[in-house]
């Protein structure tokens, strides 16, 4: 099946201090390689989460990515702060034999808007 990375939400709004889920699904797990979440694009982009085992404070995977044939690579960001605002991209990489992984497909991005916490 042809690989497609889908981020269904164009944007989500979340109150500061709350948590939010950023959805991302794949149509195929092939080619072999990791899925990573970034905020921003180009040289200024920041790695937010990687489905490769590292620990990321405040960010967790929503479903069990280790399960066979899992196509859901959504993440939950907890205790959101105004600094978390931005556009988040779910990106699929192809594993290289020795060279670095190659970026091959990305979701369309989900903009996270952080609203002031209601008093």
């Amino acid at each position: 099946k042809e690989l497609k990375v889908t981020q269904p939400e164009k944007s989500v709004s979340v109150a500061a201090g709350d948590s939010t889920v950023l959805n991302c699904t794949l149509t195929s797990l092939l080619p072999v390689g990791p899925i990573k979440w970034y905020r921003g694009v180009g040289q200024s982009r920041l790695l937010i989460y990687s489905f490769t085992g590292e620990h990321f404070p405040r960010v967790t995977n929503v479903s069990d990515a280790t399960k066979r044939n899992n196509m859901d690579f959504s993440i939950r960001i907890s205790n959101v702060t105004p600094e978390d605002a931005g556009t988040y991209y779910c990106v699929k990489f192809q594993k290289g034999p020795s060279e670095p992984d190659t970026e091959i497909q990305s979701g369309g991005g989900t903009e996270v808007y952080v609203l002031a916490k209601p008093s």
């Epitope: 269904p8 164009k10 709004s13 694009v41 180009g42 556009t87 970026e103 497909q105 990305s106 369309g108």
Partner: antibody
């Protein structure tokens, strides 16, 4: 059928103000993000501003930030652009454009309204 | 911001000929690219989105291809209505949403 009709254009002097309106019909206005895009004489298209369906999320191009204000009245199915401190370089046809519900491209456009800033 | 560069600026062709319009992005926009047609006195019209998907009601003589940084809009056989200005727009890196400078397709 989707219809977008802009009005409010005209000839003004530098430093003056103008308010553009866009009357929308044929779709559930409050469910869609709306934009203003402009085209200076003999030039290409330039994105100006975006407002979310609820009106709580707003973006501006750097060239108009601090001078233009986008707003909407969902009860009247109308989009607005308040243009203050107008400059000669703001002379353009201003289009109202409806965004696709999933991605930030434009499904439907109005015919535009001409704004001329001249002394 | 992502800069889109369209080429050529003007394309002079006869009805029935094939038109090939190019759009290059300053960084990868994957397949998040749209094409619009603008005729004098008319509203811009969405032709293609997702780099290659035709919008509703667009004839199949229009086709889009490419991904990453290089994109092409092809009009297989020009009809009189097709002489217009064409713009590409990326919606991967946003805001700001950015457009290319346009390609004018004129009658030779």
């Amino acid at each position: 059928d989707v219809q977008l009709v802009e009005s409010g254009g005209g000839v003004v002097r530098p430093g003056e103000s103008l308010r553009l309106s866009c009357a929308a019909s044929g779709f559930t206005f409050s469910s869609y993000d709306m934009n203003w895009v402009r085209q200076a004489p003999g030039e290409g298209l330039e994105w100006v501003s975006l407002i979310s369906g609820s009106g709580e999320i707003i973006y501006y191009a750097d060239s108009v930030k601090g001078r233009f204000t986008i707003s909407r009245d969902n009860s009247k199915n109308t989009l607005y652009l308040q243009m203050n401190s107008l400059r000669a370089e703001d002379t353009a046809v201003y289009y109202c454009a409806k965004e696709n519900n999933r991605y930030r491209f434009f499904d439907d456009w109005g015919l535009g309204t001409l704004v001329t800033v001249s002394s | 911001e992502t800069v889109l560069t369209q080429s050529p600026g003007t394309l002079s062709l006869s009805p029935g000929e094939r038109a090939t319009l190019n759009c290059r992005a300053s960084q990868s926009v994957y397949s998040y690219l749209a094409w619009y047609q603008e005729r004098p006195g008319q509203a811009p019209r969405l032709l293609i989105y997702g780099a290659s998907t035709r919008a509703t009601g667009i004839p199949d003589r229009f086709s889009g291809s490419g991904s990453g940084t290089e994109f092409t809009l092809t009009i297989s056989s020009l009809e009189s209505d097709d002489f217009a200005v064409y713009y590409c727009q990326q919606y991967y890196d946003r805001p700001p949403l950015t457009f290319g400078g346009g390609t004018k397709v004129e009658i030779k």
